[in-house]
Interface confidence: low
């Protein structure tokens, strides 16, 4: 499709073949706007409206909304991957992503695709924000934001790993890398998980664990295990640098406090 | 092989209706959509409607809706086209084309129905 | 819907390149990337030529490429052969789950 091929690591999924396409079911008969199934889907259905919860794993939410993570959310990629965002209207999160967070001036900025544009798209974030495959969400907890993009190579599916900054600018990991040094080694673990995905079948990072960053990219003070089902996974508290402190922890039944650390 | 085989020409008087066929055969039938499009003589391409083969659910042109009606027989992976209230603006070739879910494109064609519209 | 604008002809010499723009608005080819173009040769049936903006399905030469920018796709001929004089359609997915054809190009290899 309309992505290129050299850019960032890619999680392959299985091409669009028959096989595949025999289990197309067409989509209900009112539908307001059809978008690709989530994942490596191929198939067609109904998206989503205004104001319907979405995650990572839900339909897309349909033209000009994004699937957003509640603002207050204390970890944004964990809603998504829950199914606990919500469609939004997009140019309504730029204004405010805008508003309450001017972009920094970033080197090599490359000027949004059209499939970063276009309809449908599924973006997830990781640590801060997120909506075939597309815009960036606003979430105050990160400079950066990293989604997951849906692209398409030939009669391949495929996901892509890359950044997008505030400023629309989208960077892969090769042009990220060179500049990280400003940031912490949380967000260095973070952007390691991520580029493990790529060995990966389908996406499904259900259990793996993404690390909770402040915006410099220092570990939080809290870090928890993605929940399995109602199962709430367990928490540790961890200094700046993600060294876990005893006698901080829980396996779920009741929340952990952190007090006084460093990061907050 | 995929393909898609249409019924043979007409000619239709002016208020009257035509029944056009398209045999789908070398893939499964309902996993696919069946576009129709239409070109007058001389002119472009013009995208009539569109039905789900699997259940049968339809979208059609604005300008051509309440006239046009199309169906799909799983039982023979046949879909028809009827439009009704012919008038001389409707003499056309009319395909069907398989259109899939995956790539949004009509990617497989029939050869054309000429219909023909004269008093 | 209107249908989308295309030039009404194209054309170039043998082993030049031509490219054929299809403009819509951002409720088709500006709000998808649901864009494709067909090939037409007089008395036949048209023929996929590029899908989702720039895919070539199998048995279409490397010749023909796709790209969208904004509201505007384009369909670009390199090397061009004397059988690829034909009418050439974009297509685009709309947002009322339809679809709309451009008008058409005719391209003349002189």
């Known amino acids: 499709g309309a992505s290129s091929a050299g850019l960032g690591p890619v999680v392959r999924c299985e091409p669009c073949d028959a096989r595949a396409l025999a289990q197309c079911a067409p989509p209900p008969a009112v539908c307001a706007e059809l978008v690709r199934e989530p994942g490596c889907g191929c198939c067609l259905t109904c998206a989503l409206s205004e104001g319907q919860p979405c995650g990572i794993y839900t339909e897309r939410c349909g033209s000009g909304l994004r699937c957003q993570p509640s603002p207050d959310e204390a970890r944004p990629l964990q809603a998504l991957l829950d199914g606990r965002g919500l469609c939004v209207n997009a140019s309504a999160v730029s204004r405010l992503r805008a508003y309450l967070l001017p972009a920094p001036p970033a080197p090599g900025n490359a000027s949004e695709s059209e499939e970063d544009r276009s309809a449908g798209s599924v973006e997830s974030p990781s640590v801060s924000s997120t909506h075939r495959v597309s815009d960036p969400k606003f979430h105050p907890l990160h400079s950066k934001i990293i989604i997951i993009k849906k692209g398409h190579a030939k009669d391949s599916q495929r996901y892509k790993v890359d950044y997008e900054s505030q400023s629309t600018d989208t960077q892969n990991f090769s042009s990220e890398s060179k500049r990280e040094t400003e940031y912490g080694p949380c967000r260095r673990e973070m952007e390691d998980t991520l580029n493990h995905l790529k060995f990966l079948n389908v996406l499904s990072p259900r259990g793996v664990h993404i690390p909770n960053c402040d915006k410099k990219g220092f570990y939080k003070k809290k870090q928890c295990r993605p929940s399995k089902g109602r199962k709430r996974g367990f928490c540790w508290c961890v200094d700046k640098y993600g060294q876990p402190l005893p006698g901080y922890t829980t396996k779920g039944k009741e929340d952990v406090h952190c007090y006084s650390m460093q990061s907050k | 092989q995929m393909q898609l085989v249409q019924s043979g020409a007409e000619v239709k008087m002016p208020g009257a209706s035509v029944k056009v066929s398209c045999k789908a055969s070398g893939y499964t039938f309902t996993s696919y959509g069946i576009s129709w499009v239409r070109q007058a003589p001389g002119q472009g391409l013009e995208w009539m409607g569109w039905i789900s083969a699997y259940n049968g659910n339809t979208y059609y042109a604005q300008k051509l809706q309440g006239r046009v009606t199309m169906t799909a027989d799983t039982s023979t992976s046949t879909a028809y086209m009827d439009l009704r209230s012919l008038r001389s603006d409707d003499t056309a070739v009319y395909y069907c084309?398989?259109?899939?879910?995956?790539?949004?494109?009509?990617?497989?064609w029939g050869q054309g129905t000429t219909v023909t519209v004269s008093s | 819907q209107s249908a989308l604008t295309q030039p009404p002809s194209a054309s170039g010499s043998p082993g030049q390149s031509v490219t054929i723009s299809c403009t819509g608005t951002?409720?088709?080819?500006?709000?998808?990337?649901?864009v494709s173009w067909y090939q037409q040769h007089p008395g036949k049936a048209p023929k996929l030529m590029i899908y989702?903006?720039?895919n070539r399905p199998s048995g279409v030469p490397n010749r023909f490429s796709g790209s969208k920018s904004g509201n505007t796709a384009s369909l670009t001929i390199s090397g061009l052969q004397a059988e690829d004089e034909a009418d050439y359609y974009c297509?685009?997915?709309?947002?009322?789950?339809?679809?709309?054809f451009g008008g058409g190009t005719k391209l003349t290899v002189l």
């Open positions: 084309a398989r259109l899939s879910y995956y790539n949004y494109a009509m990617d497989v």
């Open positions: 989702e903006v720039s």
């Open positions: 951002s409720s088709d080819v500006g709000g998808y990337n649901h």
């Open positions: 297509s685009s997915y709309t947002s009322s789950n339809t679809w709309v």
